[in-house]
């Protein structure tokens, strides 16, 4: 689409100039008021999935404390609130967009009608046009002279949302541009709602019904124009015929005046037929706006019908999930409390159980100790008995003989009756070592 | 306990695309966003975006706006990133995590080469 | 963006010694902030969230403290298995941002 309009814009820019720049300056404010809308709602979206995402981290760990439970609460409303600025905000937007659209789509209605009336209508119809377009607005004019089909065509547009089936434009071409790729086969179904994560199946497949009709419309529209087309170019050539042989004729000469009165009845019946064509469309269209209007506003009850419900729906599931919560705390509270009882009367009786046995254990030590010291006295005891024993056996009366010192001793006296009387007579022997066996039978030289 | 499971390594051509998928057990699915973390050959790590499993909100980094798309199913406790119109400079470890990046996936070596 | 302003890009310690890491955000965070220990040929394993609480399984000798902009992490007694790369997470605002990472090895 993008590529069609700057191509188209580009081919007539020269013969344009003024109109050009014009729609181009408008495109661009178009453009970045889009851009700035855009970041406004990523900005808007952003700080709620943050939020959102900052609750789960909250929830995590839940602390049954009034102060917990209270930031929680701030954080759920937070939440809830900036949701709903949001939605109350799109919400304007996109009636103000709606608005907009019927606008401009009746401006465009009209200008396609005028444009088909200059390409089908005969003279008659084009004088009728100029005579009422003077007192009409323009995008009231709704000639009877159209085809079925156009007509036909238009209302289906009027009443299903446009060229778009009421559809935003981001939507509606990615739909028709995953169509095209599959050339209508049903499997384009799951990528469009890849390509589309805000719409549901259903929607998709009320959409594509709503296309096809679309498009068999459009094309029953161009062939009856093509149709008219061919049946106008006909008629000119008939026309042109009898003009022809009318020339060739004699003239008939008729009273001047009279013929002007005539033209002048004409003129007028024509154009209060025309007139009441007019004011019959009008009431046709008028009827039909305040039946689309009491249908779309039936719509919107019904939406905050569904959004109430919604909030209700919603508003209950937190509160069942804040007493489940409150319940679950209760219940591990409790059974922390039981375990937390049970652990101290455990530690009691470990505790008891443990000093008894400390007990019997310095008990036995305290016997132990007694045994010891008592067998340490028994061996001091036996001890000193040992050495008295000795003591008595030591002590023994010797009467003391002081002349002993003087007189040898017994061994002494032992050992000088032995030695003979001293002399130094010849040696007869002298002893020799023994000689070994294996040397015994060996001559010594001498 | 918690654990984020991810597929092996992939080895692709530039310019195609790659699904990772990120399975998760031991914990209730809905209940914590799923992060996805890109970790380049020698480089820091790069946060991606995340996704609330419950209603399928997504948030981007810019910078991979266009190159990854999130999404979850539901039905198998498993997120998934694609990667599209790949080129040298994607070729990474991608890690999911979740519940404040306490837990991590092992992460898939996305590898792209001619 | 948030810019997350990490320091010191790298440093060398011994074993036993304390070891503090910084992190600057460019904005109050309101302590939204992990922090992440990756050791090459590994998932990132995060150690500290939330700015100060401690993960389960991590051990003691790791602390995280700080608020508004401000944040550290220390390490009580630097032990030889807590080499690698330390990062700080923000996840206050989108899109969540990292710093650019201390290299910490051992003298």
């Known amino acids: 689409m993008e590529k069609d309009k700057h191509s188209h814009f580009y081919n007539q820019k020269s013969d344009f100039r003024i109109e050009h720049s014009m729609l181009e300056e408008l495109e661009n404010k178009l453009i970045h008021s889009r851009k700035t809308e855009r970041a406004k709602i990523q900005q808007q979206l952003a700080k709620i999935h943050n939020n959102v995402k900052k609750l789960q981290h909250q929830l995590k760990d839940v602390k049954p404390t009034p102060d917990f439970v209270e930031k929680l609460r701030e954080m759920m409303e937070e939440i809830e609130n900036a949701i709903n600025t949001f939605k109350e905000e799109q919400r304007l937007i996109y009636e103000e967009l709606i608005k907009e659209e019927k606008t401009t789509n009746n401006e465009l209605s009209a200008i396609s009608r005028k444009i088909d009336t200059w390409a089908l209508g005969n003279s008659e119809t084009e004088k009728a046009f100029r005579a009422i377009s003077s007192k009409v607005p323009v995008d009231k004019v709704t000639p009877s002279t159209l085809p079925e089909e156009v007509l036909d065509f238009e209302k289906f547009l009027q009443q299903t949302g446009g060229r778009q089936g009421a559809w935003d434009d981001y939507d509606h071409q990615n739909f028709v541009k995953v169509r095209n790729k599959h050339k209508g086969k049903p499997t384009f179904m799951e990528e469009v709602l890849e390509h589309l994560p805000g719409k549901t199946q259903d929607e998709v497949q009320q959409h594509e019904k709503w296309y096809q009709k679309f498009l068999a419309l459009e094309e029953r529209k161009k062939e009856s124009i093509q149709i008219w087309k061919t049946k106008k170019q006909q008629k000119r050539e008939e026309i042109f015929k009898l003009k022809e042989k009318a020339d060739n004729t004699p003239v008939l000469f008729h009273n001047k005046q009279e013929d002007n009165q005539k033209q002048k009845e004409e003129q007028r019946k024509k154009q209060k037929l025309a007139v009441e064509a007019w004011k019959k469309q009008k009431s046709i269209e008028m009827s039909m706006k305040c039946a689309s209007q009491l249908k779309e506003e039936e719509e919107k009850e019904k939406k905050h019908q569904k959004e109430r419900q919604r909030q209700f729906k919603l508003k209950l599931l937190l509160e069942s999930y804040t007493q489940q919560k409150k319940e679950q705390e209760e219940f591990l509270r409790l059974e922390k409390e039981i375990r937390e009882k049970a652990e101290k009367a455990e530690k009691r009786k470990n505790a008891a159980d443990e000093i008894s046995r400390f007990q019997e254990r310095d008990l036995h030590k305290l016997e132990l100790k007694i045994l010891d010291r008592q067998a340490k006295e028994d061996e001091k005891s036996q001890k000193q008995r040992r050495l008295a024993k000795l003591k008595e056996k030591v002590e023994n009366n010797v009467s003391r003989d002081p002349s002993r010192l003087y007189k040898p001793t017994k061994g002494w006296e032992e050992r000088t009756k032995k030695i003979g009387p001293t002399g130094s007579g010849p040696l007869l022997h002298i002893p020799h070592r023994a000689i070994p066996t294996w040397r015994q039978g060996i001559q010594r030289r001498v | 306990q918690v654990q984020l499971q991810q597929s092996g390594p992939e080895l692709v051509k530039p310019g195609a695309s790659v699904k990772i998928p990120c399975k998760t057990s031991?914990?209730?699915?809905?209940?914590?966003?799923i992060d996805w973390v890109k970790q380049g050959l020698g480089e820091s790590l790069e946060w991606i975006g995340d996704i609330n499993p419950n209603y399928g909100g997504t948030m981007y980094n810019q910078k991979f706006k266009g190159k990854a798309t999130l999404t979850v199913d539901k039905s198998s406790n498993t997120a998934y990133m694609e990667l599209r119109s790949l080129t040298s400079e994607d070729t990474a470890v991608y890690y999911c995590?979740?519940?404040?990046?306490?837990?991590w996936g092992q992460g898939t070596l996305v590898t792209v080469s001619a | 963006d948030i810019q997350m302003n990490q320091s010191p890009s790298s440093m060398f310690a011994s074993l036993g010694e304390r070891v503090t890491i910084t992190c600057r955000a460019s904005?109050?965070?309101?302590?939204?902030l992990s922090w992440i220990q990756r050791k090459p040929g590994k998932s990132p394993k995060t150690l500290i969230y939330?700015?100060?609480r401690l993960v389960d399984g991590v051990p003691s000798r790791f602390s995280g403290s700080g608020s508004g902009q401000d944040y550290s992490l220390t390490i009580s007694s630097l032990e030889y298995e807590d080499m690698g790369i330390y990062y700080c997470?923000?996840?206050?605002?989108?899109?969540?941002?990292f710093g650019g990472g201390t290299k910490l090895e051992i003298k």
């Open positions: 031991g914990y209730s699915f809905t209940d914590y966003n």
């Open positions: 939330r700015a100060n």
């Open positions: 904005q109050d965070i309101n302590t939204y």
């Open positions: 995590a979740h519940d404040e990046f306490i837990y």
């Open positions: 997470l923000q996840y206050d605002e989108f899109p969540h941002t």
